[in-house]
């Protein structure tokens, strides 16, 4: 049989039987609209461990009645089909008998054989239909079983829920009782608090009087203090003058045993003088007319580091000109650039190493360290000289080792067809434009990806990741 779905009547099933030259189409009854077909998505009929979909209480009995009705229909159809075939056979036999006179015995035998095979085919088809009916019956029986199981489960759940509701009722009454108790306690506490408040007010009145008396005493002390301050300033001036005299003329102390200690050239000197707390210190740099306040890092890798650059919060604008990068800007207690002139002067005193501390927005820390670091003078565009790279911020150096000149927005000394300092912002030793720029724009978390002009250290976080914080610091090689 050739089963198909008709697009017009998609609810009906057609059984087409080819018999000799004739074709008979029997329209078999389908489930009517009330019988719910279960789809794979909705409910798997063979998966007994799953709950069946919710059904009305009398649906199973309806299904059984319907099944009986369908069975009766099928039986009627089968009888009709049998009668039809028998009738058909009679008429064909008559025709064969008429033709027998004219035809040979051999032909008759052939027709007989053909009829027999056709009869066998019809019988096989009938068996198929019967099998289909039986299959459907067994499927419905399984569904029925599942439904009864599901009903049992639901009843069980209902009982459980009823028990839970009872428990909740009990808890509720307990809570009500506790609330009443708490209300009583609350009233008592309020009365106590009122008493305490009155006591405190009395205390405040007494303390106000005491404070007024103390203020009077403080004013007297302040007057005395200003006199002391004046004296202290005079002493300080005297000490400074003495220090300067000792430094300039190499005066020997009375004992003649040791030279007066020289002022600190860098944070390494500060550390070696016994100051091992990180903070701001004043250093005296060779050939610089004024002392310079710097931040000294006394914690990292043995301490003694002079911080020359620091970024942490984006509070300071680093998109500045040549003069500002030359003399420095910002505050050593926060974000700042020490100044190229000072970096040049310090690194000309003795051999220095450079350490760069980095942190990304995920809290990962890394560093790059260089065994040798110094920069050229202004005429040389503060050219960068580095040797011996190590550290955790990438195997490759993100600073140009072969010597790059310093560029700012108003001084284009890079190797690019572009103006790196303008495009990437900030002053830096740009190449073309190179794998780093710690003086770029500060971008906050979430905004720090895909940035052309951010705080970049290529071999740590890639070419377009803007870092959270950076610190550049130097220390003498012989520390």
């Amino acid at each position: 049989s050739n089963q198909r779905r008709s697009p017009e009547n998609s609810g009906r099933r057609y059984n087409r039987i080819q018999h000799g030259q004739c074709a008979y189409t029997f329209i078999l009854p389908e489930h009517d609209g009330n019988c719910r077909e279960s789809t794979t998505d909705q409910y798997n009929t063979n998966a007994l461990q799953r709950d069946a979909p919710h059904v009305e209480p009398d649906f199973s009995s309806q299904k059984l009645q319907h099944l009986e009705h369908v069975m009766e229909n099928y039986t009627q159809w089968l009888q009709k089909l049998e009668n039809y075939i028998v009738e058909n056979m009679k008429s064909e036999m008559a025709q064969i008998q008429q033709n027998a006179v004219q035809n040979h015995t051999a032909t008759m035998l052939e027709i007989g054989t053909s009829l027999l095979s056709q009869t066998a085919e019809q019988t096989r088809k009938l068996t198929d239909v019967e099998t289909q009916v039986l299959n459907q019956t067994s499927r419905l029986e399984i569904q029925l079983l599942e439904n009864s199981l599901s009903t049992y489960k639901l009843e069980k759940q209902l009982l459980q829920q009823t028990n839970e509701i009872l428990k909740i009722h009990e808890k509720n009454s307990l809570l009500e009782h506790k609330i009443l108790e708490m209300e009583g306690k609350h009233k008592e506490e309020l009365d106590t608090l009122k008493e305490e408040k009155e006591n405190l007010q009395g205390l405040v009145t007494r303390q106000t009087y005491i404070i007024q008396e103390l203020e009077k005493q403080l004013n007297r002390a302040t007057t005395n203090n200003s006199v002391l301050q004046k004296q202290q300033l005079e002493l300080m001036d005297t000490v400074h003058n003495l220090v300067n005299l000792c430094t300039k003329e190499g005066v020997l102390l009375k004992g003649g045993k040791r030279e007066e200690e020289k002022p600190f050239r860098d944070c390494a000197d500060v550390y070696q003088a016994g100051f091992n707390k990180s903070g701001i210190y004043t250093i005296y740099i060779n050939n610089m007319p004024e002392p310079k306040k710097v931040f000294c890092n006394m914690d990292v890798n043995g301490g003694g580091w002079t911080v020359i650059q620091h970024r942490e919060d984006g509070s300071l604008d680093f998109q500045r000109g040549w003069k500002e990068y030359k003399m420095g800007f910002g505050n050593p207690s926060g974000e700042y650039w020490l100044g190229n002139e000072f970096i040049f002067a310090i690194t000309s005193q003795r051999q220095y190493m450079l350490r760069i501390e980095l942190m990304d927005w995920e809290g990962n820390r890394a560093y790059s360290q260089y065994d040798r670091f110094h920069i050229g003078n202004e005429k040389q565009n503060y050219r960068l000289y580095l040797k011996g790279h190590t550290g955790t911020a990438g195997k490759q150096s993100s600073l140009i080792l072969h010597g790059a000149d310093f560029s700012t927005k108003d001084a284009d000394n890079d190797n690019c067809m572009c103006k790196c300092a303008l495009m990437l912002t900030g002053g830096w030793w740009f190449d073309a434009c190179g794998p780093s720029n710690l003086n770029g724009m500060f971008y906050t978390a979430g905004q720090n990806h895909g940035k052309l002009n951010g705080i970049k250290w290529h071999y740590f976080k890639g070419p377009s990741y803007s870092l959270r914080s950076t610190t550049m610091m130097i220390r003498p090689l012989d520390f």
Epitope: I400, N415, A432, P435, G450, L452, P463
Partner: antibody, heavy 122, light 112 residues
């Protein structure tokens, strides 16, 4: 001096192979993405292939995919283009070009080689 | 692929006069980071192309200030305030926002 010097062009028969080289100097070659761009006689510019600074990312134009291979040797500051199964339509002047910036988006070709002519003819 | 369309394809100009070339892209070239990755190149006869303008409006080093670039999104313009004899050649626009990079067909600038 910052420059790109090309070599390896010439006349080749269809179906044969050719390897182009591009030697970089005067800049940190390992920091920049590199490209090959070609120009057929009397025609416009056509991008051919790209390789990232580390060599981990590679792209090809559909017209050369499966036939051309781009590679680089950062230790030797060199870029290469291996051209196999050459066709008549591959006839062009081939340029190596360097990204303008050390960045993961093409910001332009800041530097070009002098170009080398590849002629595919029987 | 992004299609870059230049106009005009041929531009005869008298020296000292201004010139303008338009470049349109089939999709916006404005990247999420705020940049338009569009460049202008000049290829003089018998030479390699050279960068004139990058990121839409930034003049490359050594490029005379008579050249300027403008535009955003899909419409870009290259202007030459006063054309000189040395400006002859083919001008190409190129986008790098979307892969693969694509060039315009070129505009041939010639002196009248």
């Amino acid at each position: 001096e910052v420059q790109l010097v090309q070599s390896g062009g010439g006349v080749v028969q269809p179906g044969r192979s050719l390897r182009l080289s591009c030697a970089a100097s005067g800049f940190t070659f390992s920091s920049y993405g590199m490209h090959w761009v070609r120009q057929a006689p009397g025609k416009g510019l056509e991008w051919v292939s790209y390789i990232s600074s580390s060599g981990s990312t590679i792209y090809y134009a559909d017209s050369v995919k499966g036939r051309f291979t781009i590679s680089r040797d950062n230790a030797k500051n060199s870029l290469y283009l291996q051209m196999n199964s050459l066709r008549a339509e591959d006839t062009a002047v081939y340029y190596c070009a360097r990204d303008l910036l050390d960045y993961d988006i093409l910001t332009g070709y800041g530097m070009w080689g002098q170009g080398t002519l590849v002629t595919v003819s029987s | 692929d992004i299609v870059m369309t230049q106009s005009p394809l041929s531009l005869p100009v008298t020296p000292g006069e201004p010139a303008s070339i338009s470049c349109r892209s089939s999709q916006s070239l404005l990247h999420s980071n705020g940049y338009n990755f569009l460049d202008w190149y000049l290829q003089k006869p018998g030479q390699s192309p050279q960068l004139l303008i990058y990121l839409g409006s930034n003049r490359a080093s050594g490029v005379p200030d008579r050249f300027s670039g403008s535009g955003s999104g899909t419409d870009f313009t290259l202007k030459i305030s006063r054309v000189e004899a040395e400006d002859v050649g083919v001008y190409y626009c190129m986008q790098g926002t979307h892969w693969p990079p694509t060039f315009g067909q070129g505009t041939k600038l010639e002196i009248k």
